[in-house]
Amino acid sequence: TQNKALPENIKYGIVLDAGSSHTSLYIYKWPAEKENDTGVVHQVEECRVKGPGISKYVQKVNEIGIYLTDCMERAREVIPRSQHQETPVYLGATAGMRLLRMESEELADRVLDVVERSLSNYPFDFQGARIITGQEEGAYGWITINYLLGKFSQKTRWFSIVPYETNNQETFGALDLGGASTQITFVPQNQTTESPDNALQFRLYGKDYNVYTHSFLCYGKDQALWQKLAKDIQVASNEILRDPCFHPGYKKVVNVSDLYKTPCTKRFEMTLPFQQFEIQGIGNYQQCHQSVLELFNTSYCPYSQCAFNGIFLPPLQGDFGAFSAFYFVMNFLNLTSEKVSQEKVTEMMKKFCSQPWEEIKTSYAGVKEKYLSEYCFSGTYILSLLLQGYHFTADSWEHIHFIGKIQGSDAGWTLGYMLNLTNMIPAEQPLSTPLSHSTYV
């Protein structure tokens, strides 16, 4: 048997991310005998479920089963049959379901109940569906990126796996942007916190981490847009909204009932003399930026320093990984390069937003118009959130790394969630075994 590797015992895990705008299924695998090592779990598949987020199925709960079928069947194909029964399946729902629960706990429970019944029909080890808290979402995102970057490993490497990985063990902060919420999580320089609600303590691989985290509900990119429209229509003189966040020549009719459907626009709700209004794009970055800033209340802060809306934010520290919609939007706009300064990003956004809608449609013919129309707003919103909301500066901008994947695994909360629920992140540093199962003998 000289130089023959013994067959590895591989384990699998499945996590469904039930986000506000869509659901994605992630399949992870790892060698069983190394499950307490850092960095051994990796993603083998992502399956995006066709359709919107599960909260939209509140009136059609009997369709949840077919909605999830293709991705669950894909998991059945990818994972060897012999492993099905021991493969855990977790579903975590985020801000879309948090908002539904705010409207009706009964309806949210009904959706989750049908989801659970549907997922229980598969041959996997279903571990439940739940709405995770914003704090969990932030914490698990932070764990994911630092796990994948090797920040919890005690072994120092002479090589770097990813361009922005340094050999130091300083953790990265995590910036996550979804459709309905956004999270900021990092280890501040000062260990003491003024706001216990935003403090988390972890002991991972023998090291203590005091982490700051906050999730801003209603400040995901989709809900922020609804907020902005609800705010701006208040002062419109008629049913035409000239909007600087959309390209010149862009037109779209919005139902007032849709605008006020979400709890996120409640603070702007008023009786309007029309049932519909038309957005008419004028494509002006500076004016769009000003409009977005009005969503952040910075006039009140009961702490030494705040982000916005009176929420404590300690001084920013170290490098940050910005993922999910931070990455998707900036990647579309071709602004993820480490070399692009904040000033250059702003300049590019000004240019992009001012381009006529017809020109944009021609340049990006393959992109669905619904998404295409919102990149000007989303890019502007990201800049406003990072600079004015979180107080990044032109200098600290270079510490933000827009990350889609790290070593083939998506940056996001799902991996951290699974690592935690499968007890794969030990509190203490595991003792290294002289020979692992896959060692050459």
Epitope: S20, K50, I66, Y67, D222, D258
Partner: nanobody, 124 residues
Framework: EVQLLESGGGLVQPGGSLRLSCAAS????????MSWYRQAPGKERELVAA???????NYADSVKGRFTISRDNSKNTVYLQMNSLRAEDTAVYYC??????????????????WGQGTQVTVSS
């Protein structure tokens, strides 16, 4: 615009079988979801069985193990094989073709086509 025409309904004794067909006038290859719904008198329309473009299926608990949905894209047809029929299966059966919208706003479905329905009566 896709038109759907159901056939195969009728009167059958309890324990008997029927095969419903749904012929589409357009190309169903591009339609992601095809399903059968039913509506009994005085009751809400309910989803019986559905099939995706990849051929994956899903059934209401009440028909699991008795009904089988299938699709033949070359014939632009969807079938519902109904075995071990019971009196409570009596209803008008409707064929439905749809796709979900990926959007967070507006309608859940991007498009939604329905047939006229075919009556199934299970009685001795």
């Amino acid at each position: 615009e896709v038109q759907l025409l159901e056939s195969g309904g009728g009167l059958v004794q309890p324990g008997g079988s029927l095969r419903l067909s749904c012929a589409a006038s357009g190309d169903i290859f591009s339609i992601n979801y095809m399903s059968w719904y039913r509506q009994a008198p005085g009751k809400e329309r309910e989803l019986v069985a559905a099939i995706t473009g990849r051929g994956n299926t899903n059934y209401a608990d009440s028909v699991k193990g008795r009904f089988t949905i299938s699709r033949d894209n070359s014939k632009n047809t969807v079938y519902l094989q109904m075995n071990s029929l019971r009196a409570e299966d009596t209803a008008v059966y409707y064929c439905n073709a749809w796709d979900y919208s990926d959007y967070d706003e507006g309608p859940l479905r991007e498009y939604d086509y329905w047939g006229q329905g075919t009556q199934v009566t299970v009685s001795s």
